[in-house]
């Protein structure tokens, strides 16, 4: 997923308590036992600094050695640094546990920009603050790499959560994911809710904010409102899904939806920003500077470089448009749609003004991998991977930030026709088509 | 060519507000291509951004001076001002408009500048 | 707050010469970052703008280059004219604000 742009934090969060839920329709009711209720141990679990990635605490190796990880749906390895590096307080050192062991294979890692190279084991892996399971799983011991850690972002590792086909070195190098519910009884399903700051956050407040949560085996009710409506999962290498329309402001941008597949639409929680193709994003951001004319911004900004600034608390979010995002949904012909607003998609930034401004990046960006449903997407909502059925459901997130006059949205159902059309379906190449990274 | 001139009283009184008016000839100030600013130079010192404003009226002013600034334009006469009230000796400055091209990041044309002197 | 600082403050040369002139960023501004020259009674007079284009019609001795951090100014063979103050400004935060303290070539 590596990397690239990444996105802020929240200091607390906003989700009511759980004898205060909202009334829900029952039509999830239909999902096995288990599955749903309350994962107490497992909320709050993400933590994470603006732009940074969120991250889980998880310990590997015997005796158990605690390391920061990186969640990352747009990857299949579970990698961490396991050699001295200046932006790492700690790594894996393998002399020291028990438990490892070689498989004697190296893996490379290329990204656009930067890498990372190590060498494969196995090693006894469990999360403190998730499911009360120890499981083997294969690590990539992280030993030379370039422009992957970040410095001051306080994770040493990554989870990749996607699934084997992209998995590196090649398909048969078992993501954590799967080992986790091969070697467990803990169903196939994880959900995700990220909690974004929605404001700038100085150090203190940043190393200290909690950034969501990682529900492994279910799903929360106390993390989402309203009902979860869910999307297939085109095919199972990222977590593919099929966008059939977009909208700024409630303005269809009128594309032939295959436009806002090309070549592919993935949920990534290791991206920051929405990105879009190059022809869906240069209409969109000109459908966004249409609905925000009352103001000029330079061309930078729309490029993700430039910082708006505005006295602290008069940010103008009423002059910038909502984006929707329609999903195909379970049913033939019939969709619906995500909705995000200005204070997600407009990404806060600390340390760039004076403590009398709020300044933000647009973080919406150009892709020539395809969308990119990074954190922008995933801070409005709570979204389930519920692998097992081959879906990933939305919900409106109760730690989403919004003001008094607009929330997110998940909504639906919409009539839909010739949905299936809107995959675009990518020319077989070699693996080398891979070898992108994400910013 | 596109030329802007600042106009106004050169003393004004501590504890006043000093108001200056620039005049843009050869060009608009409802283009939608800029914004508009005033800019101040005390005597002998650095530049110092006091504020700026595009055509809708939307405003930007520097922290420091924020509660003291008000940038006014009006595209019927062609003209946007300043005005920065409670001045005191500190104030005393060249007062420079100017207009921020370039993608709306620089200052790419300047008035001349007027000398605004605060003093009883 | 993104604070700019130039140096030196004075440079003394002769015409003929190379002048080189540093402004340096308390962080990266990009390459969004420009630079002015003002002779004594006039208003600013923009040179350089995204760190290395010149505005329209400056002449080709005035160069900038630098990212990031730091940037430079060269005029590659002073000319009488160009005895003046320079300042740089950034605008990676918007609106522009941010100048430098200023440079000033002196005959020497």
């Known amino acids: 997923t590596h990397l690239g742009i990444r996105l802020p934090l929240r200091s607390g969060l906003a989700g009511p308590p759980l004898g205060l839920r909202l009334p829900r329709e029952t039509d999830e009711e239909s999902e096995e036992p288990g599955r749903r209720g309350s994962f107490v141990e497992m909320v709050d679990n993400l933590r994470g600094k603006s732009g940074q990635g969120y991250y889980v605490e998880m310990t590997v190796g015997s005796p158990p050695q605690t390391l920061n990880i990186l969640v990352d749906t747009g990857s299949s390895n579970f990698a961490v640094g396991a050699a001295p590096h200046p932006f790492l307080h700690r790594y894996y050192q393998r002399q020291l546990s028990s438990t490892y062991r070689d498989l004697r294979k190296g893996v490379y890692v290329p990204y656009t920009q930067g890498k990372w190279e190590g060498e494969l084991g196995t090693d006894l892996v469990s999360i403190p603050h998730g499911p009360n399971v120890t499981v083997r799983a294969n690590i990539a011991a992280i030993t030379e790499s370039d422009k992957f850690f970040i410095n001051g972002s306080n994770w040493e590792g990554i989870l990749g959560l996607a699934y084997a086909e992209i998995a590196r070195p090649d398909d048969s190098l078992e993501p954590f994911f799967d080992s986790l519910v091969k070697q467990t009884h803990i169903p196939n399903i994880f959900s995700l809710q990220l909690c974004g700051a929605g404001f700038p956050l100085n150090q203190t407040e940043a190393l200290a904010s909690v950034g969501g949560s990682m529900i492994i085996g279910g799903i929360d009710h106390s993390l989402y409102t309203g009902r979860l409506w869910y999307t297939p999962i085109r095919r199972e290498w990222y977590y593919e899904v099929i966008i059939v329309r977009v909208e700024i402001n409630g303005q269809d941008l009128k594309m032939d939806c295959k436009e806002y597949n090309y070549d592919k639409s993935i949920v990534d929680s290791g991206t920051t920003n929405l990105r879009l193709p190059k022809k869906v994003f240069e209409a969109a951001v000109k459908s966004i500077k249409a609905a925000s004319s009352t103001e000029k911004f330079p061309d930078g900004f729309w490029l993700g470089e430039q910082l708006v600034c505005w006295q602290a608390g008069t940010t103008p979010w009423n002059i910038f448009p909502v984006i929707s995002l329609y999903l195909m949904g379970e049913v033939t012909n019939q969709s619906f749609r995500i909705t995000i607003l200005p204070q997600q998609y407009l990404r806060p930034v600390e340390d760039v003004a004076t403590s009398q401004d709020d300044c933000y990046k647009f973080a919406v960006s150009q892709s020539s991998t395809g969308t990119v449903m990074g954190a922008v997407i995933m801070e409005g909502f709570y979204v389930v991977f519920d692998r097992a059925r081959k879906r990933i459901g939305f919900a409106v997130s109760a730690c989403h930030v919004h003001d008094e006059f607009r929330t997110a949205a998940v909504e639906g159902p919409f009539v839909t026709a010739d949905m299936e059309d809107c995959g675009y379906n990518i020319p077989q190449t070699d693996e080398s088509t891979l070898m992108t990274g994400r910013a | 060519q596109l030329q802007l001139q600042e106009s106004g009283p050169g003393l004004v009184k501590p504890s006043e507000t000093l108001s200056l008016t620039c005049t843009v000839s050869?060009?608009?100030?409802?283009?939608?291509?800029?914004?508009w600013g005033w800019i101040r130079q005390p005597p002998g010192k650095g530049l110092e951004w006091i504020g700026s404003?595009?055509?809708?009226?939307?405003?930007y002013y520097n922290p420091s001076l924020r509660s003291r600034v008000t940038i006014s334009v009006d595209t019927s006469k062609n003209q946007f001002s300043l005005k920065l009230s409670s001045v005191t000796a500190a104030d005393t400055a060249v007062y420079y408009c100017?207009?921020?091209?370039?993608?709306?990041?620089?200052?790419?044309?300047w008035g001349r500048g007027t000398l605004v002197t605060v003093s009883s | 707050e993104i604070v700019l600082t130039q140096s030196p403050a004075t440079l003394s040369l002769s015409p003929g010469e190379r002048a080189t002139l540093s402004c340096r960023a308390s962080?990266?501004?990009?390459?969004?970052l420009a630079w002015y020259q003002q002779k004594p009674g006039q208003a600013p007079r923009l040179l350089i703008y995204?760190?290395?284009n010149r505005a329209t019609g400056i002449p080709a001795r005035f160069s900038g280059s630098g990212s990031g951090t730091d940037f430079t100014l060269t005029i590659s063979s002073l000319e009488p004219e160009d005895f003046a103050v320079y300042y740089c400004?950034?605008?990676?935060?918007?609106?522009?604000?941010?100048f430098g303290g200023g440079t000033k070539v002196e005959i020497k």
């Open positions: 100017a207009r921020v091209g370039h993608g709306i990041s620089y200052f790419d044309l």
């Open positions: 050869g060009g608009s100030t409802s283009s939608s291509s800029y914004y």
């Open positions: 404003i595009y055509r809708s009226g939307s405003t």
């Open positions: 962080q990266s501004v990009s390459s969004y």
């Open positions: 995204d760190a290395s």
């Open positions: 400004q950034q605008s990676l935060t918007w609106p522009p604000r941010t």
